[in-house]
């Protein structure tokens, strides 16, 4: 399945609209730091296919989609940015959506990556807990932000090397 | 508010299959993971597998494995477990638990759908 | 696959009474991922507590969890009559995930 030029060019729009969405300043929420473990390895393109790839992507789409779709996180960012962030994400869910069902459709498909879905639910939770922790504070969120920035490279960064491989 | 409503209860004879449907209302349908999980009477509960209504995929427990198929309709927002090769062992309640983080991890749960196996 | 084994089977106590139930995983279970729920007959199970120590919705202040690890705690501080049920244990941390085979509390 090869995912729409599109698609690439929502992923750049997604994560310049997390970048506009950055409200104070990085330095003053240092003492918030966390290490939330990115699980790298399960995007790093070559421990699996295409397809189960894919599913991984879809896997950390959907999760970032569910986390800025919560009243805590409307509360937290300015409505109209968040909004068109939301937007690419769901266009972007589209896409893989519509590639996962293609693969699905295929015999003899590999079976599904089911550890690294777990490493990507679980990287969520942690995010997740964290938020709870801090009461969903300002720098909390700031610094999830700058996290989910970050995880969103890694799964821009894997899809451009899904695509060499094409 | 989240809503799981779950098919009746079905008797089955030994080596036939039962299919048990979750109809799923209050959220977007196709975000969350639905888990099915079953209690036989008076045991505990078990994790038999989830599926994710957004693309289809499945993730079995390997006990189930080749015997549970898990398929949902998003027309519909329902999800279905179909367990084939019945035996006794597996009268059972079968219930459907809504994915998700934190505070939501199971926190829904659909009424329970009894299929009770016996010649 | 993680065995969660949850004692005692069975916790007879009277309204008013401490109950401590406890919940040991055959290997370690990263405390986040560690859940409990309560069943009372007839009932689908209904989330108490997540990530080990923290309190779902509803829940009230009386029940607290604790532990990490393998041994894993449910409090009830003070057993109000409607307390009185089967409750179990739950890990999300690895395939498959399990259940303990369930703590019955029943009144004394």
């Known amino acids: 399945c090869d995912l729409p030029q599109t698609h690439s060019l929502g992923n750049r729009r997604a994560l310049i609209l997390l970048a506009q969405m950055g409200r104070i300043s990085h330095f003053s929420c240092l003492k918030d730091r966390h290490d939330f473990g990115f699980p790298e390895e399960e995007f790093d393109g070559h421990q699996f296919q295409k397809a189960q790839a894919i599913s991984v992507l879809h896997e950390m789409i959907q999760q970032t989609f569910n986390l800025f779709s919560t009243e805590d996180s409307s509360a937290a960012w300015e409505q109209s940015l968040l909004e068109k962030f939301s937007t690419e994400l769901y266009q972007q869910l589209n896409d893989l959506e519509a590639c996962v069902i293609q693969e699905v459709g295929v015999e003899e498909t590999p079976l599904m990556n089911e550890d690294s879905i777990l490493a990507v639910r679980k990287y969520f939770q942690r995010i997740t807990l964290y938020l709870t922790e801090k009461k969903y504070s300002p720098c909390a969120w700031e610094v999830v932000r700058a996290e989910i920035m970050r995880s969103l490279s890694f799964s821009t960064n894997l899809q451009k090397r899904l695509r060499r491989k094409d | 508010q989240v809503q799981l409503v779950q098919s009746g209860a079905e008797v089955k004879k030994p080596g036939a299959s039962v299919k048990v449907s979750c109809k799923a209302s209050?959220?977007?349908?196709?975000?969350?993971?639905m888990h099915w999980v079953r209690q036989a009477p008076g045991q505990g509960l078990e994790w038999m597998g989830e599926i994710n209504p957004s693309h289809g995929r499945t993730i079995y427990a390997q006990k189930f494995q080749g015997r549970v198929t898990m398929t949902r309709d998003t027309s519909t927002s329902t999800v279905y477990m179909e367990l084939s090769s019945l035996r006794s062992e597996d009268t059972a309640v079968y219930y459907c638990a809504r994915g998700g983080l934190g505070p939501a991890w199971f926190a829904y749960w659909g009424q329970g759908t009894l299929v009770t196996v016996s010649s | 696959e993680i065995v969660l084994t949850q004692s005692p089977a069975t916790l007879s106590l009277s309204p008013g009474e401490r109950a401590t139930l406890s919940c040991s995983a055959g290997s370690s279970v990263d405390s986040s991922y560690l859940y409990w729920y309560q069943q009372k007959p007839g009932q689908a199970p209904r989330l108490l507590i997540y990530s080990t120590s923290n309190l779902a919705s509803g829940i009230p202040a009386r029940f607290s969890g604790s532990g990490s690890g393998t041994d894993f705690t449910l409090t009830i501080s003070s057993l109000e009559p409607e307390d009185f049920a089967v409750y179990y244990c739950h890990q999300w941390s690895s395939y498959p995930f399990t259940f303990g085979q369930g703590t019955k509390l029943e009144i004394k």
């Open positions: 209050g959220y977007t349908f196709t975000n969350y993971w």
